[in-house]
Interface confidence: low
């Protein structure tokens, strides 16, 4: 009987303190897991940085929404 | 649990007014923001800024408010809104109200903003 | 950008009627809305948030519906205690926004 995988936990334990332009941002992951200090948002760049963010700053909540709007148009 | 805004008065064209609001048994969680909303007599409600209450601070403004209106969180419990060159169409009662956050998950059916709690005004009247 | 637009701006009713009142989006929302009650002299009080959840304290005759960018509160079987004021409010975004209420709505309860 193999042990269970081990699947390692992406947490955010700072968040950035400043606005990240909306035309620098490609996609956003949510960061829920209750092993982790705090929810948030880790944004994925379009030159493939992943930035922590906190998903009670508006500007947080307008991207992502932005970024949903983005990919809803996407769908076939 | 109360908010108070204070610091109303007659002023005239061109002078500038700083309001407070002091909240009394109020969380200032980090989930709320401290916001200022206007309403000129018989008039609408007209929203003007909210800030961060948590710690990043951050400021909101109504496209209309941004370089004449400058809202700041001075203590864990007071907030204030700086007014400058001002004109007859300031002529407001001035609310102060906590925007609460309805934080649920996933986006976007939370994080829902909410004016549950509101002072009872202060008036600005600018005048010559 | 996320003007709101209510109707009527004015409704008379009897008592134990029905109010309806609408509130138009420019733009999509996602029930990210608010309905306010104010009574002369008053600060507003919140009543409905999330486009539909009723605030702690709220009568149930108070009901909030809506999607996109169309959203009402319908009052049934009003009281005279109901006369005020009502407000919409959308909180789906603070970029590039004028006002985040709508005009307001006077209901008269006769």
């Known amino acids: 009987q193999p042990d269970s995988v081990s699947i390692p936990i992406t947490c955010c334990f700072n968040v950035i303190n400043r606005k990240i332009p909306i035309q620098r941002l490609e996609s956003y992951t949510r960061i829920t897991n209750i092993q982790c200090p705090k929810e948030a948002v880790i944004f994925k760049t379009k030159r493939g940085k992943e930035v922590c963010a906190d998903p009670k700053e508006r500007w947080v909540r307008d991207s992502m929404k932005h970024l949903d709007q983005i990919f809803q148009n996407l769908k076939p | 649990q109360s908010l108070e805004e204070s610091g109303g008065d007659l002023v005239k064209p061109g002078a500038s007014l700083t309001l407070t609001c002091k909240a009394s048994g109020i969380d200032f969680s980090l989930y709320s923001y401290m916001c200022w909303v206007r309403q000129a007599p018989g008039k609408g409600l007209e929203w003007i800024a909210c800030?961060?209450?948590?710690?990043?601070?951050?400021t909101y403004y109504a496209s209309w408010a941004k370089g004449r209106f400058t809202i700041s969180k001075t203590s864990s419990t007071t907030v204030t809104l700086q007014m400058t060159s001002l004109t007859a169409a300031d002529t407001a009662t001035y609310f102060c109200a906590r925007g609460i956050l309805y934080y649920t998950w996933p986006y976007p059916a939370g994080a829902i903003d909410a004016f549950d709690s509101w002072g009872p005004g202060t008036l600005v009247t600018v005048s010559s | 950008a996320y003007d709101m637009t209510q109707t009527p701006a004015s409704v008379s009713e009897p008592v134990g009627g029905t109010v309806t009142i609408k509130c138009q989006a420019s733009e999509s929302i996602s029930n990210y809305l608010s309905w306010y009650q104010q009574k002369p002299g008053q600060p507003p009080k919140l009543l409905i948030y999330?486009?539909?959840t009723l605030a702690s304290g709220v009568p149930s005759r108070f009901k909030g519906s809506g999607s996109g960018t169309e959203y009402t509160v319908t009052i049934s079987g009003v009281q005279s205690d109901d006369a005020a004021t009502y407000y919409c409010?959308?909180?789906?975004?603070?970029?590039?926004?004028?006002?985040?209420f709508g005009g307001g709505t006077e209901v008269v309860v006769k």
């Open positions: 409010q959308q909180s789906y975004s603070s970029s590039n926004v004028f006002n985040t």
């Open positions: 999330k486009a539909s």
């Open positions: 800030v961060d209450a948590g710690a990043s601070g951050s």
